[in-house]
């Protein structure tokens, strides 16, 4: 049936993980996450 | 097998509000992500809402954000969607729907479907 | 929002024909395709995901085919059963969207 690759994210650069549905941009160091991004392999919304 | 029971669906007048019920079955809830989508009066499938599995975000397009809300109770098996502010054009039948990983972080497939509870918004 | 078209919004087809039924995408997808199936009675299944799997326990005769922005599910012999509307869907970004669906008729 084909399935989930391997629990990695596949993206250019660094600092990458999956929150929520998709593969994010961690936020930088001091700021937290408002929200997760809407596509794979984007940016997270960071406060 | 899985199962995916919708009611809540009712007549409303526009402004009011109306929550949806989804009862699961078959399936390790807590761990699933679910989703609602609605089909218009001229046959139209919109995406409405999603709770992700396990760490439960929720995502709305811009035209419910602000009005619904996706919420579950792994308890209960049940997932929810809270409408409030209701418009003419949130008129629909309202589906719940499991969501399949594909690939990871990366795509989605919608692969059980409910039987849709009816809301009409009028007044 | 990436845009999802089905040109035809109806089509008819005798019992046995090989039914092939379009979708195109806004921008290229990469694959990230689904078919659902709606019976008039409103129920919906999924027949195939990233554009050609099939969904376990949907029959041989439906296949999907395509790549980039342009996708098509195939029946590869018409039969009774395969009455109704069918609809193509991007899964990748948000919003996920949908065509606006194909209704399949007897001739």
């Known amino acids: 049936q084909g399935g989930t690759r391997s629990p990695r994210c596949d993206c250019a650069g660094d600092f990458h993980k999956k929150i929520g549905l998709f593969c994010c941009r961690g936020c930088p160091a001091g700021h937290y996450l408002k929200a997760p991004c809407t596509e794979p392999c984007g940016n997270s919304t960071c406060l | 097998e899985v199962q995916l029971v919708e009611s809540g669906g009712d007549l409303v007048m526009p402004g009011g509000s109306l929550k949806l019920s989804c009862a699961a079955s078959g399936f390790i809830f807590s761990s699933y992500g679910l989703s609602w989508i609605r089909q218009t009066p001229d046959k139209r499938l919109e995406w409405v809402a999603t709770?992700?599995?396990?760490?439960?975000?929720?995502y709305y397009p811009d035209s419910v954000k602000g009005r619904f809300t996706i919420s579950s109770d792994n308890a209960k098996n049940t997932l929810y969607l809270q409408m409030t502010s209701l418009k003419s054009e949130d008129t629909a039948m309202y589906y719940c729907?499991?969501?399949?990983?594909?690939?990871?972080?990366?795509?989605?497939?919608?692969?059980?479907w409910g039987q849709g509870t009816s809301v009409t918004v009028s007044s | 929002d990436i845009q999802m078209t089905q040109t035809t919004s109806s089509l008819s087809a005798s019992l046995g024909d090989r039914v092939t039924i379009s979708c195109r995408a806004s921008?290229?997808?990469?694959?990230?395709l689904n078919w659902y199936q709606q019976k008039p009675d409103g129920t919906v299944k999924l027949l195939i995901y990233?554009?050609?799997r099939l969904q376990s326990g949907v029959p041989s005769r439906f296949s999907g085919s395509g790549s980039g922005t342009d996708y098509s599910l195939t029946i590869s012999s018409l039969e009774q059963d395969d009455i109704a509307t069918y609809f193509c869907?991007?899964?990748?970004?948000?919003?996920?969207?949908f065509g606006g669906g194909t209704k399949l008729e007897i001739k």
């Open positions: 709770i992700s599995g396990g760490d439960s975000y929720t």
């Open positions: 869907q991007q899964g990748s970004p948000l919003p996920w969207t």
């Open positions: 921008q290229d997808i990469n694959n990230y």
């Open positions: 729907a499991t969501q399949r990983e594909i690939y990871y972080g990366t795509y989605y497939a919608l692969d059980h």
């Open positions: 990233y554009t050609s």
